[in-house]
Interface confidence: medium
Amino acid sequence: IWSAVFLNSLFNQEVQIPLTESYCGPCPKNWICYKNNCYQFFNESKNWYESQASCMSQNASLLKVYSKEDQDLLKLVKSYHWMGLVHIPTNGSWQWEDGSILSPNLLTIIEMQKGDCALYASSFKGYIENCSIPNTYICMQRTV
Amino acid sequence: IWSAVFLNSLFNQEVQIPLTESYCGPCPKNWICYKNNCYQFFNESKNWYESQASCMSQNASLLKVYSKEDQDLLKLVKSYHWMGLVHIPTNGSWQWEDGSILSPNLLTIIEMQKGDCALYASSFKGYIENCSIPNTYICMQRTV
């Protein structure tokens, strides 16, 4: 069954683009596009503030988790990465960079360290971390 | 610094789409698009043959790893998923569904089980597995 002839015959048929196919974006060049949001994983380690600045310089923000359904690609992300979630000491809430409050049931918040910033980890977990610690980070751009 | 007002002011500026932005695809609806390839992660567990059939029914194939640079999003994939790599017992080589040979320096092949199929795991690892074992799988479509 594994002959190259057989395998080639499976894949050398001309395929019409079905009507269900569509373009995604627009996104910055070489970013990941999913459900019309743009994501990029940066593997240089920066503290939260530097990570935020890096995303901003690319007309983006640090990752905002707003929907398990629209962002289900995040389930499979390995490792820990800065996202745009910060602790507001005055009222004890967790907010995104745009000022919106973290919705319930989106992230499981885990206190790894004392801190006011959060790392995203697979399966919608948020690890509290000191904002000055260098980590990789995820930038996100909502398409216009 | 973390006041909602401050954070809002950062992100509520009108942003022009830079010329470096572009559309990705076309891809099947709700697939991930990256560097003009389309990917989808399926979390129903199927054996290799069923996984292949599922991808084919969507005008796609199981994941083919052909470039660390063009497919660097795969570095961060968590867990194990069927890809389109199969062992050809007659000559001992590993081939993709389209009959092409696995290029060196792309995957670290790890013998987890005796088998003729391979699971993709993060950081470009390929785990040998019995083709009949159910696993989640990754479909891929090269854009036209």
Epitope: - | N91, G92, S100, I101, P104, N105, L106, L107, T108
Partner: antibody, heavy 123, light 107 residues
Framework: QLQLQESGPGLVKPSETLSLTCTVS??????????WVWIRQSPGKGLEWIGN???????HYNPSLKSRVIISVDTSKNQFSLKLKSVTAADTAVYYC???????????????WGQGTTVTVSS | DIQLTPSPSFLSASVGDRVTITCRAS??????LAWYQQKPGKAPKLLIS???TLQSGVPSRFSGSGSGTEFTLTISSLQPEDFATYFC?????????FGQGTKVEIK
């Protein structure tokens, strides 16, 4: 003991095609564990990887030469070949055919080399 | 393309000396780095790859270390037959690239 031997003209005129052949002895060129490679060395550019070929014919080329280079394999003669089109003086170099050390689908350097053949591009 | 920068490009040493050559990659290449020795009129000879693994038949006075972007070749006690040019090569991604070489000469 695997041995490689380059052959071909030592002098090529500008704008012509450089053609070299590498004959493999002591092993089969179609062994599934072997890839084959061309590398050149010039005083100006040092060592430069030209490209690789697998016994099945699949290739990888240096992007800087891709538009001018063809590497092919002839399993019946146990040979692989290099053609470099539209040569200039900058292509003057010692050309080596070689075999990369390949283990578990990873390249670990080039462990068998031909003795090299000097090609001069001049009218 | 990944650039490899050797240091120094020229080295003058005596028999018995400990010699260290460095190769810096323009981006991370894990441990996919090879070291070669070349004598005049001869093809390069593979000494070490990946990064720290000595090839069979290579004397134990040669050793390699490093990962990512910084790599080192060390000859613990230089012998007369070690006077040659040493090259590094990255095999992390195509196109494969080589450093310009470090020439080790007799002082």
């Amino acid at each position: 003991q695997l041995q490689l031997q380059e052959s071909g003209p030592g002098l090529v005129k500008p704008s012509e095609t450089l053609s070299l052949t590498c004959t493999v002895s002591g092993g089969s060129i179609s062994s599934s564990s072997y890839y084959w490679v061309w590398i050149r060395q010039s005083p100006g550019k040092g060592l430069e990887w030209i490209g690789n070929i697998y016994s099945s014919g699949s290739t990888h080329y240096n992007p800087s030469l891709k538009s001018r280079v063809i590497i092919s394999v002839d399993t019946s003669k146990n040979q692989f070949s290099l053609k470099l089109k539209s040569v200039t003086a900058a292509d003057t170099a010692v050309y080596y055919c070689a075999k990369p050390l390949l283990r578990d689908y990873y390249y670990y350097g080039v462990d068998v080399w031909g003795q090299g053949t000097t090609v001069t591009v001049s009218s | 393309d990944i650039q490899l920068t050797p240091s120094p490009s020229f080295l003058s040493a005596s028999v018995g000396d400990r010699v260290t050559i460095t190769c810096r990659a323009s981006q991370a290449i894990s441990s996919y780095l090879a070291w070669y020795q070349q004598k005049p009129g001869k093809a390069p000879k593979l000494l070490i790859s990946p990064a720290s693994t000595l090839q069979s038949g290579v004397p134990s006075r040669f050793s390699g270390s490093g990962s990512g972007t910084e790599f080192t070749l060390t000859i613990s006690s230089l012998q007369p037959e070690d006077f040659a040019t040493y090259f590094c090569q990255q095999l992390n991604s195509f196109p494969w690239t080589f450093g310009q070489g470090t020439k080790v000469e007799i002082k």
